[in-house]
């Protein structure tokens, strides 16, 4: 939602967290600001303090409950407001009617591990974190492998169009150090976006056996 010169963007992690970023042209000096969440059909409301992330943008996480608790559903609408202190009062700086399951961004996949590694291939698995049971199998993944001498941006994206929490990387070079990352996205939601990339998993392929081509 945009109000005046500000941009207010929030995402729901599908369980118990709404993360928000508010950016404002002509940054407010020494002003306390917060995000206030007011669901239309729940007894609770929640507030978080916006903290600066750059010259003109602030971020905060609305913690709605225990990490794996299902605090919102597809029918919920949450009024989200940015409030900034002016004198003794709060001023509404931005406001949006937030539909959580239209604005999803899951947590980065966790527990990456090498299941099996050979000279030319490596099987890697991972787990999704704090993802709603509502999705069932309606998730997709993107993965990328960092090769020596390249950057993450240059790494080709591998797309897994189903809920598959493993991958078999092939055509790798023997005795070579690689890094691997994966991210997840639900199929649901008009404004849904990819999760952050997972922490990179470093692995090394096995050296080729002497005098043998494996």
């Amino acid at each position: 939602a945009v109000n005046g010169t500000s941009q207010f963007t929030c995402f729901y992690n599908s369980r118990a967290n709404i993360s928000c970023v508010w950016s404002q042209d002509g940054a407010l000096q020494d002003t306390s600001c917060q995000v206030h969440a007011w669901p239309d059909r729940r007894r609770w409301n929640q507030t978080c303090e916006l903290l600066p992330v750059s010259q003109a943008s602030w971020a905060c996480n609305l913690i709605l409950g225990a990490p794996d608790s299902q605090k919102l559903t597809t029918v919920d609408i949450v009024t989200l407001r940015v409030l900034c202190r002016e004198g003794v009062r709060w001023r509404v700086m931005a406001i949006q009617d937030f539909k959580p399951f239209e604005n999803l961004r899951l947590m980065a996949p966790i527990s990456l591990q090498v299941v099996h590694v050979e000279t030319h291939r490596c099987n890697i698995s991972w787990e999704i974190s704090q993802a709603s049971h509502y999705f069932e199998r309606h998730l997709e993944f993107e993965a990328r492998t960092l090769s020596p001498g390249h950057t993450w941006e240059e790494a080709p994206l591998l797309t897994l169009k189903q809920k598959q929490e493993w991958i078999c990387l092939e055509t790798l070079t023997p005795d070579t150090q690689y890094e691997f990352q994966v991210r997840v996205k639900p199929l649901q939601g008009e404004f849904t976006t990819w999760s952050p990339w997972s922490q990179p998993l470093a692995f090394r392929t096995k050296p080729a056996a002497l005098g043998k081509d494996t």
Partner: antibody, heavy 121, light 112 residues
């Protein structure tokens, strides 16, 4: 019905202090801000500052800083405005007014009846 | 501080006729959230101020629809479509966009 009832008229000597009260009823006192506005005889309105009774937090117009003190007593839903080092130009009607804690629409909706303060030697 | 200048100082009007009051701010009073916190108050003789209009053009509850507000940036107007006897008094504009909040000097509406 929202009501703000202020204390009676005061006559003070220059250099003295005056304390005006504003008793609120008809709403939850600690949910709204109380602003203070003054009107010198035949003059316009001047915003002095405000207090949030919920936590006692105050904000004063620079013009009055050091001379004005705003307090509240939540047990009797009353706000106070004390002005010190009075001079003749402080002769005015002093108003309290209610305001929303979240300023989304307007600053002040309901006003007290006003308290006349006369500063004269 | 934002200086609010009203004109005219005095406005003699005929009952049933329209009236218009101007208010000009010394600087733009659009708040950084995009809203313009320009309000109009009416003060009848011997009474406290009463909120008429907020955010330039919104009538406060109970305010007759003969009162309307308009304007943007630094220039604002309060109009009374057909003046009635009970409209006599002083009208003040007020800006709540930039602390310290400030009032105009007032316009006295009287019947000819």
């Amino acid at each position: 019905e929202v009501q703000l009832v202020q204390s009676g008229a005061e006559v003070k000597k220059p250099g003295a202090s005056v304390k005006v009260s504003c008793k609120a009823s008809g709403y939850t006192f600690t949910d709204y801000v109380i602003s203070w506005v003054r009107q010198a005889t035949g003059q316009g309105l001047e915003w002095m500052g405000e207090i949030y009774p919920g936590d006692g937090n105050t904000y004063y117009n620079e013009m009055f800083k050091g001379r004005v003190t705003m307090t509240r007593d939540t047990s009797i839903s009353t706000a106070y405005m004390e002005l010190s080092s009075l001079r003749s130009e402080d002769t005015a009607v002093y108003y309290c007014a209610r305001g929303s804690y979240t300023y989304d629409n307007y600053a002040m909706d309901f006003w007290g009846q006003g308290t006349t303060v006369t500063v004269s030697s | 501080d934002v200086v609010m200048t009203q004109s005219p100082l005095s406005l003699p009007v005929t009952l049933g006729q329209p009236a218009s009051i101007s208010c000009r701010s010394s600087q733009n009073i659009v708040h950084s959230n995009g809203n313009t916190y320009l309000e109009w108050f009416q003060q009848r003789p011997g009474q406290s101020p009463r909120l008429l209009i907020y955010k330039v053009s919104n009538r406060f509850s109970g305010v007759p629809d003969r009162f309307s507000g308009s304007g943007s940036g630094t220039d604002f107007t309060l109009k009374i479509s057909r003046v009635e006897a009970e409209d006599v008094g002083v009208y003040y504009c007020f800006q709540g966009s930039h602390i310290p909040w400030t009032f105009g000097g007032g316009t006295k509406v009287e019947i000819k």
